[in-house]
Amino acid sequence: MPEPGKKPVSAFSKKPRSVEVAAGSPAVFEAETERAGVKVRWQRGGSDISASNKYGLATEGTRHTLTVREVGPADQGSYAVIAGSSKVKFDLKVIEAEKAEPMLAPAPAPAEATGAPGEAPAPAAELGESAPSPKGSSSAALNGPTPGAPDD
């Protein structure tokens, strides 16, 4: 049980990993906070991400998900997730379609579909995890001022 009066530290129990994704596919990043009810912000190049046609944001208790839909070359780069004073950076690398599947001749039609209709694409390749940046971020916040600033 925490000491009364002490402010809890918002930290990640699971950090998003950098991924390589084929152009046109979605990229899904997952983070888990140690407690529920914690505000999480996702960033691209230091700017906060809002839910849109391009980005899907979801929370279920401690689980937080960012989906980048139909990734293209413009989506490649550095991303971050912030909870309180904890910030974790990760990267998205986009593989162009012709680089992903080089073909000399048209492939014959498959005899059977490899995935059920509506099935999620295969998981993207993981590139590993980047280290958290120094605590505290000076960027503008969607859910608050400088992350981790006491507000009670």
Epitope: M1, S50, S52, T59, E60, G144, P147, G148
Partner: antibody, heavy 120, light 112 residues
């Protein structure tokens, strides 16, 4: 001193429309706090209504709202509005403006409230 | 929607005594629970957040505990100023079910 102050309450007929305004002072409104509205019927408990993110891009409404209420905010005016339409007698309550914590979803600052009475 | 059931609806205790208020959630809310104190004609005041943390200025006589779906608020060494209505709030967030904030029905504390 950090303060919230609601205005715009009063008597309105069933089916009517009313807009409540919350004036923010004493803290940097543009720095990112989510702002919410909570109501309390006479002699009853608290009921969350809606919240809006700092950029106005994200909004949340309680499921029971069913599109009748709209929350908005103006960074230049330091205000948060709640537009209420198709009001019924059941909407009679004191309406509070509340600020969420920057790091979690609880409310750490409240306004004194404004009374809305829906009656013919 | 998450439903918060608070018991008892009312409790009476003497100055210097102890009261315990319970809050039961309809599902596990992972410690995303706050308690508020409200006096007549006033807005609620934050007492406890994240189940057991006290904001600065709140006396340590107020203690929160619990986990999963069951939570408690204990007020010890009761003072006349503690006479108020107390509310629990779940702030477990679920995008899929649109959960963000649910209050219990409140508990009136009467101090003799």
């Amino acid at each position: 001193q950090e303060q919230l102050e609601e205005s715009g309450g009063g008597l309105v007929k069933p089916g009517g429309t009313l807009t409540l305004t919350c004036k923010v002072s004493g803290f940097d409104f543009s720095s990112g706090y989510d702002m919410c509205w909570v109501r309390q019927a006479p002699g009853k408990g608290l009921e969350s209504i809606a919240c809006i993110g700092s950029s106005s891009a994200s909004t949340w409404y309680a499921n029971w709202v069913n599109g009748r209420f709209t929350v908005s905010r103006s960074t230049s005016l330091n205000t948060v509005d709640l537009k209420m339409t198709s009001l019924t007698v059941a909407d009679t309550a004191t309406y509070f403006c509340a600020r969420e914590s920057s790091t979690e979803y609880y409310y750490n600052l409240w306004g004194p409230g404004t009374l809305v009475t829906v009656s013919s | 929607d998450i439903v918060m059931t608070q018991t008892p609806a009312s409790v009476e205790a003497a100055v210097g005594g102890t009261v315990t208020i319970k809050c039961q959630a309809s599902q596990s809310i992972g410690n995303a629970l706050a308690w508020y104190q409200q006096k007549p004609g006033q807005p609620p005041k934050l007492l406890i957040y994240s189940t057991s943390y006290l904001p600065s200025g709140v006396p340590s006589r107020f203690k929160g505990g619990g986990s999963g779906a069951e939570y408690t608020l204990t007020i010890s060494d009761l003072e006349c100023a503690d006479a108020a209505t107390y509310y629990c709030q779940s702030y477990y967030v679920s995008t899929s079910s649109s959960d963000r904030s649910s209050f219990g029905g409140g508990t009136e504390v009467v101090v003799k």
